[in-house]
Amino acid sequence: KNSFTKLSIEPAFTPGPNIELQKDSDCCSCQEKWVGYRCNCYFISSEQKTWNESRHLCASQKSSLLQLQNTDELDFMSSSQQFYWIGLSYSEEHTAWLWENGSALSQYLFPSFETFNTKNCIAYNPNGNALDESCEDKNRYICKQQLI
Amino acid sequence: IPFLEQNNFSPNTRTQKARHCGHCPEEWITYSNSCYYIGKERRTWEESLLACTSKNSSLLSIDNEEEMKFLASILPSSWIGVFRNSSHHPWVTINGLAFKHKIKDSDNAELNCAVLQVNRLKSAQCGSSMIYHCKHKL
């Protein structure tokens, strides 16, 4: 698995009429300018947006703001010293931090989450740091599409 | 300066083959039709070159400004596959092609290997230890 010697030659890009994930018998694809890593596609912004703007931009790409499975999910960018909006917000109804799909934040993901201000949104650094910041603040953001 | 993103959310976005299709080794990333090994360990330029060769790939090369800005956004610095034999020689790629882009600090005779560092290329001592990344075009 760690070798390129058996690469099949295929066209560099598959033209597609829309931004749906292209799937064929053995292949999935990420949109151009998205990063493919461990069966997921990520869009890593360089522009700064509010949390809501970020959420809408991800949604417009049939993706959502990053939902982390574990703290090494973005291992490939663990050297980054930027913070990015992720898809975590506080639900007054459930009195819990929830991801966009409604699942609850694992207490093991951010040990300091109990000190987060529930009026804020969460900015994440891929090294594992998380900050609660006003949702009106501007940060870069990460969108995620799960392919499997 | 952050690269412009106005085209990134167009409705006719092209697609690229992703790692999980078997085109890139496990734990590599795919971006714009290339596979990248994102190194954590530090090596000299020559050691980095050999490390990438052993992975059947090449020391990081930069094909365009968009790629440079993407990489710079996720990595603080990295060796790239550009060097010169001395300050009297031109900068060349590991494939032997002339490298035309501006490399900072080129006037320093001790700095004969190139580094990508936050949206710019600069020269560095080939014997110093830096993080390296490898690339393989699909």
């Epitope: 740091n129 006003s134 009106e136 | 936050v118």
Partner: antibody
């Protein structure tokens, strides 16, 4: 190019007030956290306060909490520090500072500083 | 709060010398470390960020290394304009903190 210019420093009596201003230019002001850092004469550097891009997230060092107020006006590209109940130990050069492009919390650009002297 | 301890607090050296200044964090800060140079009457100037990345415009004789708790700033061949005070700073967690400074003097 990035420029940060502080003003408003001067001599003030203990218990008095001062308002420092910082005029920013050469970058998109609303995209960056802004900081105030101070340096007492002959001493090291000390974080005073910072403010997030929208002005909603704010931090103060314990030594100034309750006495200093940081604010910003993104329309005017300006940063402010309102200093009340000043003490002799607040005497310092106050620097307005902007984060580095790549590294949050690292100061990429500093103003020239403005001296605040608290003395009777 | 994370404490940053620099050593030595002062060092005397000559033009052409190689000088190393160390900085130790009281807890791990990954590579969230910066180095600054300050000359009398002037604002500090960023030299190194992310522990080892050289700030644009800074001469290549300056280099940084380290990760976790132990970091070094090295000046490979001292120039007359390098005599100044050097500070390390952690940006890993609030409140961000500076080392106490290392004064580099002419021998």
């Amino acid at each position: 190019q990035v420029q940060l210019v502080e003003s408003g420093g001067g001599l003030v009596k203990p218990g008095g007030s001062l308002r420092l201003s910082c005029a920013a230019s050469g970058f998109t002001f609303s995209d960056y956290y802004m900081r105030w850092i101070r340096q007492a004469p002959g001493k090291g550097l000390e974080w005073v306060s910072h403010i997030s891009t929208s002005g909603s997230t704010i931090y103060y060092a314990d030594s100034v909490k309750g006495r200093f107020t940081i604010s910003r006006d993104n329309a005017k590209n300006s940063l402010y520090l309102q200093m009340n109940s000043l003490r002799a130990e607040d005497t310092a050069v106050y620097y307005c500072a902007r984060d580095h492009y790549y590294s949050r919390g690292v100061i990429g650009y500093w103003g020239q500083g403005t001296l605040v002297t608290v003395s009777s | 709060d994370i404490q940053m301890t620099q050593s030595p607090s002062s060092v005397s050296a000559s033009v052409g010398d190689r000088v190393t200044i160390t900085c130790r964090a009281s807890q791990g800060i990954s590579s969230w470390l910066a180095w600054y140079q300050q000359k009398p009457g002037k604002a500090p100037k960023l030299l190194i960020y992310a522990a080892s990345s050289l700030q644009s415009g800074v001469p290549s004789r300056f280099s940084g290394s380290g990760s976790g708790t132990d970091f070094t700033l090295t000046i490979s061949s001292l120039q007359p304009e390098d005599f100044a005070t050097y500070y390390c700073q952690q940006a890993n967690s609030f409140p961000y903190t500076f080392g106490q400074g290392t004064k580099l003097e002419i021998k």
